[in-house]
Interface confidence: low
Amino acid sequence: EDELQVIQPEKSVSVAAGESATLRCAMTSLIPVGPIMWFRGAGAGRELIYNQKEGHFPRVTTVSELTKRNNLDFSISISNITPADAGTYYCVKFRKGSPDDVEFKSGAGTELSVRAKPSAPVVSGPAVRATPEHTVSFTCESHGFSPRDITLKWFKNGNELSDFQTNVDPAGDSVSYSIHSTARVVLTRGDVHSQVICEIAHITLQGDPLRGTANLSEAIRVPPTLEVTQQPMRAENQANVTCQVSNFYPRGLQLTWLENGNVSRTETASTLIENKDGTYNWMSWLLVNTCAHRDDVVLTCQVEHDGQQAVSKSYALEISAHQKEHGSDITHEAALAPTAPLGGSG
């Protein structure tokens, strides 16, 4: 009778992660008596995958009933394949021996490659906000994919970005890979509603790329512009001075009125007007009883935005000679207006 041959018909098999891999093996004879075993890798460090004679291998099932005497099919199926299962698998016939079974003949091997999808891209922005015209960095990470070939693109509001650097690790062979990319984005005043998108294309995604997004609203701080003006009043002895705080983001804002350098009132912005670009406007005003002042008054609108250093704008309120003559003992009054144009005061 011809000497037993171990036939592994497929040189390679490619399987998607999570699926089962069938590794085919057939013998040409039942002689010599002894078990077959499947190993991953060759040499002294090879890993036992399945042992016909004994063992408990939860992920491995035999394609045929190996206990049948006339069975020559020793193919196995490995369930729930992960990238860690990649490698070359050998079907090996052993001759029954003492004290150990003796290797008789090995198949040529079947290389199992695993196609693993990249994880959903995670995009993260800068730890601190930056102002328009500054450049901020966004990172995009995805892990666990195989094979190594992968494409990553960055977009801002649908427009592809070019200023980015991408690394795929590790550089050498591995069961799975990770990608890390950093994009540099120049902020503009209109970026409150903007998004950056990291798009990953991989063979496992069948043309449907994965996307991760980040909102520039988390990265941008648009400082307010201040304008202090005096509004006309019917009453001769009252002045209405407004502070228009415009185009700021994010919301957090505290406004302090000062009269000749002395704090008159502090307010926290609450009811804001949102602009189309996502920035906010707010108006505060001060009613000044001009009879209470003998001299001209410098009114300062001081704004602290998003924990930053305060910015201010001043306005010189002139007191007429007539008011100076009649105002020596009239008490000073600063009050909120009863109605609130443009959202009013808080």
Epitope: L48, N51, K53, E54, G55, H56, F57, P58, T67
Partner: antibody, heavy 118, light 107 residues
Framework: EVQLVESGGGLVQPGGSLRLSCAAS????????MHWVRQATGKGLEWVSA???????YYTGSVKGRFTISRENAKNSLYLQMNSLRAGDTAVYYC????????????WGQGTMVTVSS | DIQMTQSPSSLSASVGDRVTITCRAS??????LAWFQQKPGKAPKSLIY???SLHSGVPSKFSGSGSGTDFTLTISSLQPEDFATYYC?????????FGQGTKLEIK
């Protein structure tokens, strides 16, 4: 020498908790499937729980949701966290090593006694 | 769960006797069957795995056979140290289950 030494047993009231430990020596615990088996006084053996080399865990029906098996590779130790203990959990608890490829039990610890009583 | 049934529950024998204990599984367990010996106040000792393979250090007077659902443990020539309780166990699938035990006593 390959050895398993259990500890942590004792007297606990019903509803209480206990954590059993099993210190392995002479082999790397993480390379083997590990088990807990118990034996009530005068009764037979009952398999309780197992943890595979990949960290997969298994439990007998009566302890599911109450017991948690775990291992700490750095300490080469196996643990069994037992919560909501009942009188029926009173037994000697053995730590057992499974065979490299077939998971047949080969090495047993000396056991630790757990008594659940008010 | 797979039920394991041992017979007999107890057995009296003399030194030098050959004894056989049987174990039946409620379903096919291939050859994933183990035998253990336990003496009073001691931890069990592993004797046999995969129905017929002896653990290291176990004397050859112990032998196991069977596959599928029916298995036997044979002790060829009883010695005083062999009087103990013997358990079979299936380990083909979780939860692993033991037989109720066979107590081997001196006649």
């Amino acid at each position: 020498e390959v050895q398993l030494v259990e500890s942590g047993g004792g007297l606990v009231q019903p509803g209480g908790s206990l954590r059993l430990s099993c210190a392995a020596s002479g082999f790397t615990l993480s390379s083997y499937d590990m088990h807990w088996v118990r034996q009530a006084t005068g009764k037979g053996l009952e398999w309780v729980s197992a943890i595979g080399t990949a960290g997969d865990t298994y439990y007998t029906g009566s302890v599911k949701g109450r017991f948690t098996i775990s291992r700490e590779n750095a300490k080469n130790s196996l643990y069994l966290q037992m919560n909501s203990l009942r009188a029926g959990d009173t037994a000697v608890y053995y730590c057992v090593r499974g065979g490299v490829w077939d998971d047949a039990f080969d090495i047993w610890g000396q056991g630790t006694m757990v008594t659940v009583s008010s | 769960d797979i039920q394991m049934t041992q017979s007999p529950s107890s057995l009296s024998a003399s030194v030098g006797d050959r004894v056989t204990i049987t174990c039946r599984a409620s379903q096919d367990i291939n050859n994933y069957l183990a035998w253990f010996q336990q003496k009073p106040g001691k931890a069990p000792k592993s004797l046999i795995y995969t129905a017929s393979s002896l653990h290291s250090g176990v004397p050859s007077k112990f032998s196991g056979s069977g596959s599928g659902t029916d298995f036997t443990l044979t002790i060829s020539s009883l010695q005083p140290e062999d009087f103990a309780t013997y358990y079979c166990q299936q380990y083909v699938s979780y939860p692993y289950t033991f037989g109720q035990g066979t107590k081997l006593e001196i006649k």
